[in-house]
Amino acid sequence: EPTMYGEILSPNYPQAYPSEVEKSWDIEVPEGYGIHLYFTHLDIELSENCAYDSVQIISGDTEEGRLCGQRSSNNPHSPIVEEFQVPYNKLQVIFKSDFSNEERFTGFAAYYVATDINECTDFVDVPCSHFCNNFIGGYFCSCPPEYFLHDDMKNCGVNCSGDVFTALIGEIASPNYPKPYPENSRCEYQIRLEKGFQVVVTLRREDFDVEAADSAGNCLDSLVFVAGDRQFGPYCGHGFPGPLNIETKSNALDIIFQTDLTGQKKGWKLRYHGDPMPCPKEDTPNSVWEPAKAKYVFRDVVQITCLDGFEVVEGRVGATSFYSTCQSNGKWSNSKLKCQPVDCGIPESIENGKVEDPESTLFGSVIRYTCEEPYYYMENGGGGEYHCAGNGSWVNEVLGPELPKCVPVCGVPREPFEEKQRIIGGSDADIKNFPWQVFFDNPWAGGALINEYWVLTAAHVVEGNREPTMYVGSTSVQTSRLAKSKMLTPEHVFIHPGWKLLEVPEGRTNFDNDIALVRLKDPVKMGPTVSPICLPGTSSDYNLMDGDLGLISGWGRTEKRDRAVRLKAARLPVAPLRKCKEVKVEKPTADAEAYVFTPNMICAGGEKGMDSCKGDSGGAFAVQDPNDKTKFYAAGLVSWGPQCGTYGLYTRVKNYVDWIMKTMQENSTPRED
């Protein structure tokens, strides 16, 4: 507890003090007072630097004194032998004695009293900026007229803060301008404009005179502009050293003028105005700005339109343009949106064709579709080359965005038929010689594949079984071979309307219009053993002449077997119809005259006993295309005959091309279109 006075005596005083003692006293007087410590008696063993025994006076970290030996008063009217005056309210006294004393020493007697200190004069640092007033136990500061005492109760300043300027134009000056500004003041001015306007400050050099910087370049008095996280200044000196036009890029500006105690000058004067916030003319690649201006400011709106082949992608939606507004913060809205190259995406796959994985799917990239050659070709032209267009579609010069269509190549066998050893009027054949050959198991017959979805056959083959099972791709019709080949499932059978349906088909004598189409449920995949035959053209080039050669194939009756195990084939010439009429019917079911011969029939055969027979019905009579020697077309279909091994009659397919095309078109699926 602080006291105003007190006494300090060495141990055993006034008797001799003991050896090896260390004792300390902490003196504390009230705040605002100093301490006067005085010794009235001092008798301590003397040693150099008081090393043996001593009394030590410490103020804070400073040793005020160290005493030893004997002292007596110099003044007969005063008992004080030694005294100390400190301007602080705390003091420590420490007494130490060593292990031996040569004589008997009595120690010391000391007294302390609280003394008033003059804070206004006793310290190096003046506590008040202007006037200092001392009183017992403290002091107070006071200010000259028009100044006020700051909250720290030490500093005086002028009342120059708190002004807020909201007008779009204005003038601000230092206090008393152009008279000297007040010392020791901090003046803060706030400019607060509507959002979207930036504060622009203008000064004239001659309107600025502020105490110059010290030798280290630090302003003693300073003017600072703060706009958000940007600072302009500090500025000081004679004549404004900064830019005469300060664009703050902010609608809020704080002006801070700080002065010290000395060196007042005339100060400063500035003007400000609000400019609509400018937005930078940004370089947005691959786009055009509308309207185009040299400068854009707050509330300006531009339409940014992507160049062809570029788009702005927001989420999953692609657009070709977007609007951007110059915002109050000087930034464009939608600034994250960019015109990126259009991405056409992974190209769609096509049936029976392929497209190489593109290196890029962006605008301008090129891809190429190819068909699975040699079994398919590109029907709708265009060469298969597509480029990624500006609208995000893969586009072909001819077809536009329409995909290429790979359709089967017709009439081209993978291996040409060569007549090998003679086998009862024909030769062994391989399915690769006749990849269009279709096998019907009930009744045992043939047919010709004409495209992915359609099989052409004779009407008499399907009239009794409208759900025939068919196979393609096998030379042998042994069960194990057919199990490995492709089974075709019919969707619908279309018999020519001119074919007369009989109650007893076995007694038929009229085979006119012996033609039918079978629509398949699923498309047939083409390859070396499965490939369609062409249809005849409608021009006169496809009119057959006597002697024209055609190929027939099938698993029908041979001289040795009722049914061939492996495919057989023969090359035979077209003959005049009368040759067929002249042959006697082997097992007539009616009078010979009852058999009907029409222009819808082709007569062929008669050479070396080569002929089609029971079980070959519906198969193609394949003739080389007069306009493309690499291809075969179905000139006829095995229909009927008077006698195996002589002449046979074949349905003249050319006469039915219109019906075939019409039937296929009317019964196609969207998938096939």
């Epitope: 009930n442 042998s476 019709v477 042994q478 195990v565 492996r566």
Partner: antibody, heavy 119, light 107 residues
Framework: EVQLVQSGAEVKKPGASVKVSCKVS????????MHWVRQAPGKGLEWMGT????????IYAQKFQGRVTMTEDTSTDTAYMELSSLRSEDTAVYYC????????????WGQGTLVTVSS | DIQMTQSPSTLSASVGDRVTITCRAS??????LAWYQQKPGKAPKLLIY???SLESGVPSRFSGSGSGTEFTLTISSLQPDDFATYYC?????????FGQGTKVEIK
């Protein structure tokens, strides 16, 4: 009329081999696919293998792989089946069977050859 | 290889009964399934091929159905001549497999 005539019954010791023949009459062997099927007394039918004329290779059931050999002599229209390393469980009637056409699996069966394996 | 499982292994029935035998393949064989009838000491006789096609000369009381892995042989009205063992057979590739057989005996 096509017929399959098989060789007569055989009695063999364990470890020995047996070769059963099957002669085709009324047709040529080249036009046919010959299969071999066996049936142990009181047991079910077991398919052993066949010669595939299209591929020119013989296909054997996994069970008989390495022990059975099927050959054909087209000059005499005779098919052969040889089974080696005989054991008692090989005692069975061995049939040669022609493959059918157009979905019919087996067309014609031989009369069967009884092979007895006994020590 | 494909496994063929026939059920039941034995079936007791009377003349005039409707009899059904089933055959299950371990994997799909489409419609490549045949049914045979075998009498003691005789070679098997083909009844049905391609799951449902009746071999010529076989009485119409025999019928077959199914595709994929499940197949059925039905005798609509059992006759005295029908007491025999029946086998199913898969032949969708060159590895042909028989079922273990179903013996139809007189009740």
């Amino acid at each position: 009329e096509v017929q399959l005539v098989q060789s007569g019954a055989e009695v063999k010791k364990p470890g020995a081999s047996v070769k059963v023949s099957c002669k085709v009459s009324g047709d040529t062997l080249t036009e046919l696919s010959m299969h071999w099927v066996r049936q142990a007394p009181g047991k079910g039918l077991e398919w052993m293998g066949t010669f595939d004329p299209e591929e020119g290779e013989t296909i054997y059931a996994q069970k008989f792989q390495g022990r059975v050999t099927m050959t054909e002599d087209t000059s005499t229209d005779t098919a052969y089946m040889e089974l080696s390393s005989l054991r008692s469980e090989d005692t069975a009637v061995y049939y040669c069977v022609t493959e059918g056409l157009a979905g019919v699996p087996f067309d014609l069966w031989g009369q069967g050859t009884l092979v007895t394996v006994s020590s | 290889d494909i496994q063929m499982t026939q059920s039941p292994s034995t079936l007791s029935a009377s003349v005039g009964d409707r009899v059904t035998i089933t055959c299950r393949a371990s994997q799909s064989i489409s419609s490549w399934l045949a049914w045979y009838q075998q009498k003691p000491g005789k070679a098997p006789k083909l009844l049905i091929y391609k799951a449902s096609s009746l071999e010529s000369g076989v009485p119409s009381r025999f019928s077959g159905s199914g595709s994929g892995t499940e197949f059925t042989l039905t005798i609509s009205s059992l006759q005295p001549d029908d007491f025999a063992t029946y086998y199913c057979q898969s032949y969708n590739s060159y590895v042909w497999t028989f079922g273990q057989g179903t013996k139809v005996e007189i009740k």
